[in-house]
């Protein structure tokens, strides 16, 4: 009778992560008597995958009943495949021996390749906010994919970016891979509503790429422009002065009025108006009692925006002259404001 051969008909098997892999193996003879075992890898450190008689292998099932007398099908199924399962699997026939069974014949091996989807890309921006005209870096990370080939693109508001660097790790063979990319983005005043998108395409995604996004509203700081104007007389001895704070983002803003350098009132922006570009406008009023002043009054509107150093605009109020409408600053644009009267 011809000597037993162990046949593994599949040179390679490709399985998606989470699926079940079937590894086929048949023997050509029932002799010699002894068990079949499955290993991953070869040599002394090989990993035991299945032993039909001993050991705990909860993920492995046999295709046929190995206890049947004439069984020569030793194929197995491995459930819930992960990238860590990739490798070459050998079906090995043992001959009963003493004290231990002796390896008799091995199959040629079946290479199991695992296709694993990349994780959802995570986009992160700079830790601190930056102002328009500055360049900021965004990173995008995705993990756990296999095979290694992957494509990553960056977009800002639908427009593809070109200034980025991408690495796929590790460089050599691995069960799964990670991608890391850093893109540089120049901020503009209109970027409050902008989005940066990282798009990852991989063979496992069947043409439907994964996207990660970052809102530039989390990154940008648009500093305000200030304009202080004097309003028409309301009463013989009272003058109304307004400070228009325009085009700022985020909303966190504190305004202080100073009369001749002395703090008159401090308030926090609350009822603001939003512009189409996502920035905010706000207006604060100060009612000045002229009769309480003998000399000219220097009124200063001081604004601290988002924890940054204060910016200010001043207006000189002439006490000697009859209070007529006068302005110290020319308005840049005519925007609606939420008038807040505080006396």
């Amino acid at each position: 009778e011809e000597e037993l051969q162990v046949i593994q008909p599949d040179k390679s098997v490709l399985v998606a992560a989470g699926e079940t892999a079937t590894l086929r193996c048949t023997a050509t003879s029932l002799i010699p008597v002894g068990p079949i075992q499955w290993f991953r890898g070869a040599g002394p450190g090989r990993e035991l995958i299945y032993n039909q008689k001993e050991g705990h292998f909860p993920r492995v099932t046999t295709v046929s009943d190995l206890t049947k007398r004439n069984n020569m099908d030793f194929s197995i199924r491995i459930g819930n495949i992960t990238p860590a399962d990739a490798g070459t699997y050998y079906c090995v026939k043992f001959r009963k021996g003493s004290p231990d069974d002796v390896e008799f014949k091995s199959g040629a091996g079946t290479e199991l390749s695992v296709r694993a989807k990349p994780s959802a890309p995570v986009v992160s921006g700079p830790a601190a906010r930056a102002t328009p005209q500055h360049t900021v870096s965004f990173t995008c990370e995705s993990h756990g994919f296999s095979p290694r080939d992957i494509t990553l693109k960056w977009f800002k508001n639908g427009n593809e970016l070109s200034d980025f660097q991408t690495n796929v790790d590790p460089v050599g063979e691995s069960v799964s891979y990670s991608i890391h990319s850093t893109a540089k983005v120049v901020l503009t005043r209109e970027d409050v509503h902008s989005q940066v998108i990282c798009e990852v395409a991989h063979v496992t995604l069947q043409g439907d790429p994964l996207r990660g996004t970052a809102n530039l509203s989390e990154t940008i700081r648009v500093p305000p422009t200030l304009e202080v104007t004097q309003q028409p007389v309301r009463a013989e001895n009272q003058v109304n002065v307004t400070c228009q704070v325009r085009k700022f983002y985020p909303q966190r803003l504190q305004l202080t009025w100073l009369e001749n350098g002395n703090v008159s009132r401090t308030e926090t922006a609350s009822t603001v108006t939003e512009n189409k570009d996502g920035t905010y406008n706000w207006m604060s009023w100060l009612l000045v009692n002229v009769s309480a002043h003998r000399d000219d009054v220097k009124l200063t509107c001081q604004v601290e925006h988002d924890g940054q150093p204060a910016v200010s605009k001043s207006h000189d109020l002439k006490v000697s002259a009859h209070p007529k409408e006068q302005g110290s600053n020319t308005a840049a644009e005519n925007t609606g404001s939420n008038e807040r009267n505080i006396y």
């Epitope: 008597v33 002394p44 450190g45 090989r46 990993e47 035991l48 039909q52 008689k53 001993e54 050991g55 705990h56 292998f57 009943d65 190995l66 206890t67 009963k96 004290p99 231990d100």
Partner: antibody
Framework: QVQLVQSGAEVKKPGASVKVSCKAS????????IHWVRQAPGQGLEWMGR????????KHNPKFHDRVTMTRDTSTSTVYMELSSLRSEDTAVYYC???????WGQGTTVTVSS | EIVLTQSPATLSLSPGERATLSCRAS???????LYWYQQKPGQAPRLLIY???NLASGIPARFSGSGSGTDFTLTISSLEPEDFAVYYC?????????FGGGTKVEIK
């Protein structure tokens, strides 16, 4: 569900033999080895041997020389472990365990005393 | 035969503490064949870890196994009251199958 049910406690005199049974249910009896493991009072676990229920093939711990005999009855899905020439040091709880090492019998206490 | 030496013999710890149990083999054991068990008084051993590092079904994630060759470790990240028991390592790489002498984890 998978079960290994062992025979009851035994008290034996030195020099006698004891035969402990282990009845399997809930799985294909010929699937895996059945091992025998013992534990003397306050001591650790000691592997005695195993039997392949499919063909009766056995392996045993050389420590027991030829004192241990393992057999099986496929008609009742039962394996047996017989220990001969008993001595006081053989006083122990004897466990049968399925080849996956997950399923164990409840244990059989064997006391050897004159 | 492969002799498995467990240390320490006794580990006195409080609930919430981390337990690290060692098992050293007299000759190299492929990880696939190294198992860990928990045993409580009057009960049969219970499989905790198979193939050196895989958690058996129903075993809490606070248990973990590691190691290769001749040095293996069982770690309990934060002891629960029900974890106080005796732990055994076991090899079935070669005949005769052997167990370590056990480590008793007791309440301090």
């Amino acid at each position: 569900q998978v079960q290994l049910v062992q025979s009851g406690a035994e008290v034996k005199k030195p020099g006698a033999s004891v035969k402990v049974s282990c009845k399997a249910s809930g799985f294909n009896f010929e699937d895996t080895y059945i091992h025998w493991v013992r534990q003397a009072p306050g001591q650790g676990l000691e592997w005695m041997g195993r039997i392949d229920p499919a063909d009766g093939d056995t392996k045993h711990n050389p420590k027991f020389h030829d004192r241990v005999t393992m057999t099986r009855d496929t008609s009742t899905s039962t394996v047996y472990m017989e220990l001969s020439s008993l001595r006081s040091e053989d006083t122990a709880v004897y466990y049968c365990a399925r080849g996956n090492y997950v399923n164990w019998g409840q244990g059989t206490t064997v006391t050897v005393s004159s | 035969e492969i002799v498995l030496t467990q240390s320490p013999a006794t580990l006195s710890l409080s609930p919430g503490e981390r337990a690290t149990l060692s098992c050293r083999a007299s000759s190299s054991v492929t990880s696939s064949y190294l198992y860990w068990y928990q045993q409580k008084p009057g009960q049969a051993p219970r499989l905790l870890i198979y193939s050196a590092s895989n958690l058996a079904s129903g075993i809490p994630a606070r248990f973990s196994g590691s190691g290769s060759g001749t040095d293996f470790t069982l770690t309990i990240s934060s002891l629960e009251p029900e974890d106080f028991a005796v732990y055994y390592c076991h090899q079935w790489y070669s005949y005769p199958r052997t167990f370590g002498g056990g480590t008793k984890v007791e309440i301090k």
